[in-house]
Interface confidence: medium
C-alpha cells in the first residue's frame, strides 16, 4: 500500500462521552490537519475510512457498522453512536484516501459512567460569571447536530443533584440558564439533560459545566501594592538578612496577565551583581481576585546594598503601579564607656 501521512494520536482531542447516550464525533482531519473540508474531499473522489483499536489492545480493527438499530454509523465526516456502550472506549482512526493520496489521524474516545447526581470522571468546561453584573446566561453545550430544528427537545437543568426550580436568582429558559444576578453561592456544577425522540426511540444528552463566579469588571481596579508601604522601614546592619515582601492585590480581570517584579537601582535583580533570591506565592479570593507576594531576599546585606533603591512593580490590564521600599542602615547603638563618656566631656 502507498505511504500514508500519519498525524499520529491527537491527544489534544481527549473525547469523553457518557455511556448509553448518543455521541457524534467529527473526523479531526478536516478540523485541524487538512486545509480542505469533507465536501471538497468527497467531490475529489477521496473516501473516508474509519477503524479503531480497543482499549488495552494493539490490533486495529474495522468498526462494525452492521450492528442492530445502526448503533454505530457514519454520516459524511461524522461517526455516530446511538447510543454508546462502555466498551466503545478506545483509539479511533479516520483515514482519507484514494489511489494516490492518503492521510490519517487517530484520537482517543473514552466512554464514561455517571452516577444519579451526574458525577463522573468527565473533565468539565468552566464558565465564569461576573458577580452582581446583571443577567448572564449559560447555554447547554455541544448539542448542535444531534436532532433537526423541527424536533423540540425537553431540557431539564440541575445544580448538583437538584432540579432547578424556584431558585431565587436562577431561571431555566430552554437551552439557556439565566442568572438574574450571580452570587458566589452560584458556584458549582450545572447539568442540562436534553431529551429528544428519534425513530421511535428516546435519547438523552447530559452536559455538565462548572460555573465560577468571579469579580466584576465594574469593580476592577489597578493593582494595589499593600507592601512595601510608608509605614515600614527595613533597617538592617551589614551582614544581616534583608527580606522585603512585595504584596500586590489584583482585581479579577478576564484573560489579564498579572505581573509583579522587583527592580534594584532601576535594573532587574538578575542584572545586579548581588546574591538576590525572589520567592513568589499566589493566593486567590472567592471571586478569583489574586494576591501575589514576591519576597526579595539578600542573605548577607552589605552597606552598599543598603544604599540601593528597591522598587516593587505590578501590572495588570488595568494599569501599572510601583512602590519603593524604605531601606536604611541601622545606626549602631553607642557604647557608653567610650562614646557617651566623650560626649559628656570626660577625658
Amino acid at each position: 500500500s502507498e505511504r500514508c501521512d500519519d498525524w499520529g494520536l491527537d491527544t489534544m482531542r481527549q473525547i469523553q462521552v457518557f455511556e448509553d447516550e448518543p455521541a457524534r464525533i467529527k473526523c479531526p482531519l478536516f478540523e485541524h490537519f487538512l486545509k480542505f473540508n469533507y465536501s471538497t474531499a468527497h467531490s475529489a473522489g477521496l473516501t473516508l475510512i474509519w477503524y479503531w483499536t480497543r482499549q488495552d489492545r494493539d490490533l486495529e480493527e474495522p468498526i462494525n457498522f452492521r450492528l442492530p438499530e445502526n448503533r454505530i454509523s457514519k454520516e459524511k465526516d461524522v461517526l455516530w453512536f446511538r447510543p454508546t456502550l462502555l466498551n466503545d472506549t478506545g483509539n479511533y482512526t479516520c483515514m482519507l484516501r484514494n489511489t494516490t493520496y492518503c492521510s490519517k489521524v487517530a484520537f482517543p474516545l473514552e466512554v464514561v459512567q455517571k452516577d444519579s447526581c451526574f458525577n463522573s470522571p468527565m473533565k468539565l468546561p468552566v464558565h465564569k460569571l461576573y458577580i452582581e453584573y446583571g443577567i448572564q446566561r449559560i447555554t447547554c453545550p455541544n448539542v448542535d447536530g444531534y436532532f433537526p430544528s423541527s424536533v423540540k427537545p425537553t431540557i431539564t437543568w440541575y445544580m448538583g443533584c437538584y432540579k432547578i426550580q424556584n431558585f431565587n436568582n436562577v431561571i431555566p429558559e430552554g437551552m439557556n440558564l439565566s442568572f438574574l444576578i450571580a452570587f458566589i453561592s452560584n458556584n458549582g456544577n450545572y447539568t442540562c439533560v436534553v431529551t429528544y425522540p428519534e425513530n421511535g426511540r428516546t435519547f438523552h444528552l447530559t452536559r455538565t459545566l462548572t460555573v465560577k463566579v468571579v469579580g466584576s469588571p465594574k469593580n476592577a481596579v489597578p493593582p494595589v501594592i499593600h507592601s512595601p508601604n510608608d509605614h515600614v522601614v527595613y533597617e538592617k546592619e551589614p551582614g544581616e538578612e534583608l527580606l522585603i515582601p512585595c504584596t500586590v492585590y489584583f482585581s479579577f480581570l478576564m484573560d489579564s496577565r498579572n505581573e509583579v517584579w522587583w527592580t534594584i537601582d532601576g535594573k532587574k535583580p538578575d542584572d545586579i551583581p548581588i546574591d538576590v533570591t525572589i520567592n513568589e506565592s499566589i493566593s486567590h479570593s472567592r471571586t478569583e481576585d489574586e494576591t501575589r507576594t514576591q519576597i526579595l531576599s539578600i542573605k548577607k546585606v552589605t552597606s552598599e546594598d543598603l544604599k540601593r533603591s528597591y522598587v516593587c512593580h505590578a501590572r495588570s490590564a488595568k494599569g501599572e503601579v510601583a512602590k519603593a521600599a524604605t531601606v536604611k542602615q541601622k545606626v549602631p547603638a553607642p557604647r557608653y564607656t567610650v562614646e557617651l563618656a566623650c560626649g559628656f566631656g570626660a577625658t
Epitope: G160, N168, I184, S185, S285, R286, D289, T291
Partner: antibody, heavy 122, light 107 residues
Framework: QLQLQESGPGLVKPSETLSLTCTVS??????????WGWIRQPPGKGLEWIGS???????DYNPSLKSRVSISVDTSKNQFSLKLSSVTAADTAVYYC??????????????WGQGNLVTVSS | DIQLTQSPSFLSASVGDRVTITCRAS??????LAWYQQKPGKAPKLLIY???TLQSGVPSRFSGSGSGTEFTLTISSLQPEDFATYYC?????????FGGGTKVEIK
Amino acid sequence: QLQLQESGPGLVKPSETLSLTCTVSGGSISSSTYYWGWIRQPPGKGLEWIGSIYFTGSTDYNPSLKSRVSISVDTSKNQFSLKLSSVTAADTAVYYCAKEDDSSGYYSFDYWGQGNLVTVSS
Amino acid sequence: DIQLTQSPSFLSASVGDRVTITCRASQGISSYLAWYQQKPGKAPKLLIYAASTLQSGVPSRFSGSGSGTEFTLTISSLQPEDFATYYCQQVNSYPLTFGGGTKVEIK
C-alpha cells in the same frame, strides 16, 4: 423569622466523635443564596470558623480541622449536622450554627443559633 | 490564611463617647469584611457587612469603613447596651477568619 437551633450532647469523651445537629425553622435550608456554617468559641476566647455547607451538599472546611470534620445536610428535615472526630480537651467550646447570606454578593453570618457548650472530658 | 488583627484588644469608654475599633488584614480583601457584636453568654450579632453596609435593624450610630487591608468600626455615641466584644470577620477567601476581638468596657 428564621431560627436556628443546635442540639447534641454537652459532654463528649476524649478520642470520641462530637456530633451536633442544627435545625432550621422559619425558612428553607434549600434557598439558593444561603450557606450554612458551624463556628466555635472556646471559653473566654475568640471565634473560629469550622466549615460551611450548601444545600446541594458541597462543603468547605477550615484546613486546621479538615482531617477530623464532616458537615452534612438533610434538606427533607431542614437540618445540617457537624461531626468532629478524635476530640481532645482543646475542642471544648460553644458550638454555633449560623446562616451565611450571599444575597448581597458579600457573605456574612446574619442568623445564629444560641450555641451549644460541648465539654470534652473523661 | 488571612490573619485579622484587631486593635485595641480592650477599650474603656464612657456613655456618649465616640469609639473606633480597627481591623487590619494580612492581605487585601477588597470589601469582604463583616463586623459582629457579642455579649456574654449570647451568640454574635451581625452589625455590618461588605465593610460599610449596615445590617437591617442595627442602630445608625454604628458605621464601618475601609477597603483592602485597613477597616474601621465606629460607634458615634456609645450607649449602655453597646458594652460588649466586637469581632471583625473576612469572607474574602477560605478559611473564613475572625479577628481576636475588642472588648469595650465601661470606664
